[in-house]
Amino acid sequence: MAVTACQGLGFVVSLIGIAGIIAATCMDQWSTQDLYNNPVTAVFNYQGLWRSCVRESSGFTECRGYFTLLGLPAMLQAVRALMIVGIVLGAIGLLVSIFALKCIRIGSMEDSAKANMTLTSGIMFIVSGLCAIAGVSVFANMLVTNFWMSTANMYTGMGGMVQTVQTRYTFGAALFVGWVAGGLTLIGGVMMCIACRGLAPEETNYKAVSYHASGHSVAYKPGGFKASTGFGSNTKNKKIYDGGARTEDEVQSYPSKHDYV
């Protein structure tokens, strides 16, 4: 029951996380104009991974896509790539985890197969979350660097008579959405991996021997008396199992743990 709950919760948390990663990737507010210590502009600039927007004080918003691929900064391309990889891995992970859910029955899928699928989806969620966190963090680092560079320019470029309004950018809402979503996907992945351990067939640490006793079958042959009890040092009928002291019939019925046909 705990395993099912852990797996289900892991799936739901990852689902929310991946939805968040998709939302963050599509959002326009990755960086927003810094309003602190700046003149009150009648325009508000903000930028996303795919386009930049300007919201005028009049209420009109104009967005322009980045219609160039080669002209964009390498860092931005890297962030795009990380977010897309995160989304793709997360989507595949979700697909795999749906079939791995203990509460969903698909044919005669064995628990070991479900355990493997749970582990696979868990790893995918972890990598997906890490990609999102990495992407957002790279962008945030880029912003911090540019922020201090433009701040330095603000105080060094005041020599002339004409002043220029230096537009500085700070963290946008998408960064926080991305960090939280990445974290949730990561947590969901860890939960799936924990659930996987509980789904795997239980194993004990001791070895046991089961015997096939042939009984006291006495054979009379000309030329003397020979008796074979079947309990001698003859190891032909002796079988060693790593999985508990059971008869061979019991062991064969084990894989379908709960379903006795």
Epitope: A42, V43, V54, E56, S58, E62, R64, Q163, V165, T167
Partner: antibody, heavy 118, light 113 residues
Framework: DVQLVESGGGLVQPGGSRKLSCAAS????????MHWVRQAPEKELEWVAY????????YYAHTVKGRFTISRDNPKNTLFLRMTSLGSEDTAMYYC???????????WGQGTLVTVSA | DIVMTQSPSSLTATAGEKVTMSCKSS????????????LTWYQQKPGQPPKMLIY???TRESGVPDRFAGSGSGTDFTLTISSVQAEDLAVYYC?????????FGAGTRLELK
Amino acid sequence: DVQLVESGGGLVQPGGSRKLSCAASGFTFSSFGMHWVRQAPEKELEWVAYISSGSSTIYYAHTVKGRFTISRDNPKNTLFLRMTSLGSEDTAMYYCVRFYYGNSFVNWGQGTLVTVSA
Amino acid sequence: DIVMTQSPSSLTATAGEKVTMSCKSSQSLLNSGNQKNYLTWYQQKPGQPPKMLIYWASTRESGVPDRFAGSGSGTDFTLTISSVQAEDLAVYYCQNAYIYPLTFGAGTRLELK
């Protein structure tokens, strides 16, 4: 057709108060930022105050800050300017203006004249 | 506050003549986000409220005759009337539409000979 009609102007004693109104029609009033702009006789234009579509953002010119209050009633399509502690320098034609693309003042009312005199 | 300086304060032209008037701002009106200059030109005829002619420094408002053209970037802007007509007799104002307070120039009075 967009129409902006100002009212409430007139002769005011120095130190007195006045409330100007602007009735808007012909556009979705609640979607646009609005301004008051004034023009003293034979002088240039002077921006007075701005209010965003939802009244969340308000700005004033330094010369009127603390004395004037801009407000709006979206259901009634009306813009207001409450003026207090009026002085002779506030004598002007007051225009109600609609904000548009490029932060431009696209539609102007005919104006209402406020004269501050003893 | 941004100071808008217009020149000349007045100019006289004959019908059909090309006229230009200048507007300078104390700070750049160019917004880096969309590479647009937030400068607007208005025309005010005697006894009337102003009428918007050009926004974003060079975009003509619908209904404005194409003889009116705006140009310039950053801090230096120009309004050109390619062929002055009698109805163009007015005062022309430039306005900073970028930083609050939104300031106007003192105007250029266009008179006809």
